[in-house]
């Protein structure tokens, strides 16, 4: 996948929806300048492409939704990278620009004559991309052309700002909510001193900013905050881990507002540096319950507590997806490449045969082997349905009593579509209500996951709690097995009776040394000793002063 030739998946229709999925991994640092993408991705890529194709099939066969109108799509690869996604979005825009100059499908030539060449239909809206940083860049372009964008996993708080991102909506909540959930977990276990790491880019930066702001209000101190690129090299991750170890044994908890591949980079560095078990990672939904994050590095990940957007598996998607085969799946142009990558074999005689694999793919291979559905599948499908319901509502209001596209709806006005989309309210794929607030955001419901060793060399994610609109519920026994196992992440222990906290210059408020008050002093507050007035003495609990009883000396009393 280099910048010269980009593959596109098409599905014909009366109305075309664009989609940006990370079909391939982002370019490595040395390949960024040529925008050469990485390996093909299953969950974030191929599954989402197939979800789009199959969901549109379901919508098109539903007589109650957009009757007499066929939805089609144009799917492009974002490679989880802004430059690639922008390049692809320009292609969407180009289609729109050409189409707006059409007259009944005929393109006007320079000399004024008509050409019978029918250009591509315009893109009426875009689904995706997954990354917040990439979504922001794409939105900056799309909104210039009034093209609504519905995201399925871009959760950055910045995207709630409608003055900046007017044509952006999402079926997921803003990160402000999961930052709150992470702070609530830290509070629950009395972790008052934690290290912080975030992925460079909008998702990590704005999420961590919110986490730090909320932490400060709750009296939680950040030992140090670090940022790193998701595609940073081994040395960068090693350096980051060494910095984190400098805060041990006090800051054992590391809050990571990170993309999944950043977490994986940390786990790999933990292996190299011999740091398995030294930290407890508290991860955002970029990690969630992804096996591609922990595979091969389970020992390093054990104990990790992660936030996952509530989204049950979609059964009907698996029923469709698991039957797919390279011999019959021709509409997904990346499928053969994926099949060969997935099974590490060569599809002999196929157009995309990859000679780097020695083994030939046999006919018994099936996607059922080690199948894991994309954790955000429900959101991807809900985003597509949102676009369909928005178009449906728009058609109902612009074309009353008419089945199909009426003239009032042609060409589709992005401003009117946005209006219609914002009012959308329907039952999502998992039975939950899908609606948008005034910022185009959806409500926040999260599951709390814990990565555990379930048996010898068997590891898995266990659901240990939930966070629903501000309420945290946790099964502490499942996480810790016994109270004494709860990890401590504090800078200084509480002071003993008669001692005050002395915070060293330049230290955070959670780090102090305990100093005893003088013999004639009491603890006025946790930072101050005060001398008792003449004629009084500190009480036994050293929290105040008692008058010294007057003793009159008499002749014959022994010397004191």
């Amino acid at each position: 996948q280099s910048s010269e030739r980009r593959v596109v998946a098409h599905m014909p229709g009366d109305i075309i929806i664009g989609a940006l999925f990370s079909v391939h991994h982002q370019p490595t640092v040395d390949k960024v300048h040529e925008r050469k993408c990485g390996a093909v991705r299953e969950q974030y890529g191929i599954q989402r492409v197939e979800a789009m194709l199959h969901t549109l099939e379901r919508i098109n066969s539903d007589p109650t939704l957009l009757p007499n109108i066929t939805l089609g799509c144009e799917i492009r690869d974002s490679c989880w990278h802004s430059a690639v996604a922008l390049e692809q979005s320009i292609e969407f825009i180009r289609d729109s620009l050409i189409s707006s100059e059409e007259e009944e499908g005929l393109v006007r030539c320079v000399d004024g004559s008509s050409s019978s060449f029918r250009s591509k239909k315009p893109i009426v809206g875009v689904i995706g991309p997954g990354s917040s940083s990439v979504a922001i860049q794409v939105q900056n372009l799309l909104q210039l052309f009034n093209i609504p964008q519905i995201a399925y996993s871009a959760t950055s708080m910045d995207l709630s700002d409608k003055t900046l991102f007017k044509y952006f909506m999402r079926v997921v909540p803003s990160d402000a909510q999961q930052a709150r959930a992470m702070v609530d977990i830290v509070k629950r276990y009395n972790w008052t001193y934690v290290s912080a790491v975030h992925t460079e880019g909008n998702y990590g930066e704005s999420g961590m900013e919110a986490f730090k702001d909320m932490s400060a209000k709750e009296g939680i101190c950040i030992a140090h905050s670090y940022k790193i690129y998701s595609n940073a090299g081994e040395q960068s991750f090693d350096k980051l881990l060494k910095k984190l170890t400098s805060h041990l044994p006090k800051a054992r908890v590391v809050a990571c507002f990170c993309e999944g591949m950043t977490v994986r980079g940390l786990l790999m560095a933990m292996r190299r540096l011999g740091l398995a078990g030294e930290f407890l990672l508290l991860g955002s939904d970029g990690w969630a319950d992804r096996y591609d994050v922990t595979d091969g590095y389970q020992r390093e990940a054990v104990g990790g507590i992660t936030i996952k957007l509530q989204s049950p598996d979609v059964k009907w998607f698996d029923d469709y997806y698991l039957k797919l085969r390279p011999e019959t799946n021709h509409r997904n142009p990346w499928f053969q490449e994926f099949w060969q990558h997935r099974f590490q074999c060569r599809l002999e005689g196929f157009p995309q045969e990859n000679s780097k694999y020695n083994k030939t793919c046999n006919s018994s291979l099936t996607l059922k082997t080690h199948h894991v559905q994309d954790s955000k599948m429900g959101f991807v499908i809900n985003a597509i349905y949102s676009m369909a319901y928005g178009l449906h509502n728009m058609q109902m209001s612009l074309c009353p009593g008419y089945a199909g596209l009426c003239d009032a709806m042609k060409p589709i006005d992005g401003r009117k579509l946005l209006e219609s989309l914002m009012k959308t309210n329907f039952t999502g794929v998992s039975g939950d209500t899908i609606l948008f607030d005034e910022n185009g955001d959806s409500p926040g419901r999260y599951e709390i996951m814990n990565f555990k060793e379930m048996g010898k060399d068997y590891f898995d994610y266990i659901n240990v709690g939930s966070w629903d609109n501000g309420e945290l519920k946790m099964d502490d026994d499942e996480v810790w097995s016994k109270k004494s196992n709860i990890i401590r992440s504090v800078c200084s222990e509480p002071c003993e009776k008669g001692q005050i906290k002395v915070i060293r210059k330049g230290e955070v408020s959670c780090c102090w040394t305990c100093t005893p008050c003088k013999e004639n002093e009491y603890v006025f507050d946790e930072y101050t000793c005060k001398a008792c007035q003449l004629g009084s003495w500190p009480t036994d609990d050293l929290t105040g002063c008692d008058l010294i009883p007057v003793q009159y000396l008499r002749w014959g009393d022994p010397e004191p």
């Epitope: 060494k242 044994p249 540096l273 011999g274 030294e278």
Partner: antibody
């Protein structure tokens, strides 16, 4: 400070435990290494016990040595010494809770393995 | 793991000596230098490839990055006669020896 003890003359195959006693700092805050030096030879890192209790060993030392600790002592157990294990053994405090720079060395204790 | 050169070097008082240390892979500047005199335990001179440990004179200078590191001692004094060792301080995992083989510095 750190101080080693337990070094003596042993016959090959006889298990031997060296003890490092620490004072002035807590083993729950620092990693503790064992390093040895054969007569006239260079320094050889054996292994480390982290503040958390995790242990790591040099590839050649795996299975031959075991490091363990209490609140104020760190033990190095030589499971089956050979004549090649004759050396001065140093107990060394790390500069952090894990593996880093060695900034506090004990005077060393001599182990002689001979038949 | 760590290759140190030369094994031995003889330098006149007031001269300069350069000792090199090469790691088998990048250690991201997590390198320390130690000085050891006969009958004594080693003493930390430099950490983080270039930071002087407390009480170490500025005549001792560490440099390098990635896999190549150098210790330079200028204005050599008789008291600098010792064996010098480098140590990778990055990881205890999969290590044969954290230390270099040592360089004996003889001051004439």
């Amino acid at each position: 400070s750190v101080e080693e003890s337990g070094g003596r003359l042993v016959t090959p195959g006889t298990p031997l435990t060296l003890t490092c006693t620490v004072s002035g700092f807590s083993l729950s805050d620092y990693g503790l290494n064992w390093v040895r030096q054969a007569p006239g030879k260079g320094l050889e890192w054996i292994g480390i016990i982290y503040a958390s209790g995790s242990t790591y060993y040099a590839n050649w030392a795996k299975g031959r040595f075991t490091i363990s600790k209490t609140s104020t002592t760190v033990d190095l157990k030589m499971t089956s010494p050979t004549t090649e294990d004759t050396a001065t053994y140093f107990c060394v405090r790390d500069s952090s809770a894990t593996y880093d720079y060695f900034n506090l060395w004990g005077p060393g204790t001599l182990v002689t393995v001979s038949s | 793991d760590m290759t140190q050169t030369p094994a031995s070097v003889e330098v006149a008082v007031g001269g300069t000596v350069t000792i090199k240390c090469q790691a088998s892979q990048s250690i991201s500047s997590y390198l320390a230098w130690y000085q050891q005199k006969p009958g004594q335990p080693p003493r930390l001179l430099i950490y983080g490839a270039s930071n002087l440990a407390s009480g170490v004179p500025s005549r001792f200078k560490g440099s390098g990055s990635g896999t190549e590191y150098t210790l330079t001692i200028s204005d050599l004094e008789c008291a600098d006669a010792a064996t010098y060792y480098c140590q990778q301080a990055l990881s205890p995992s999969n290590v044969d020896n954290a230390f270099g083989g040592g360089t004996e510095v003889v001051v004439k």
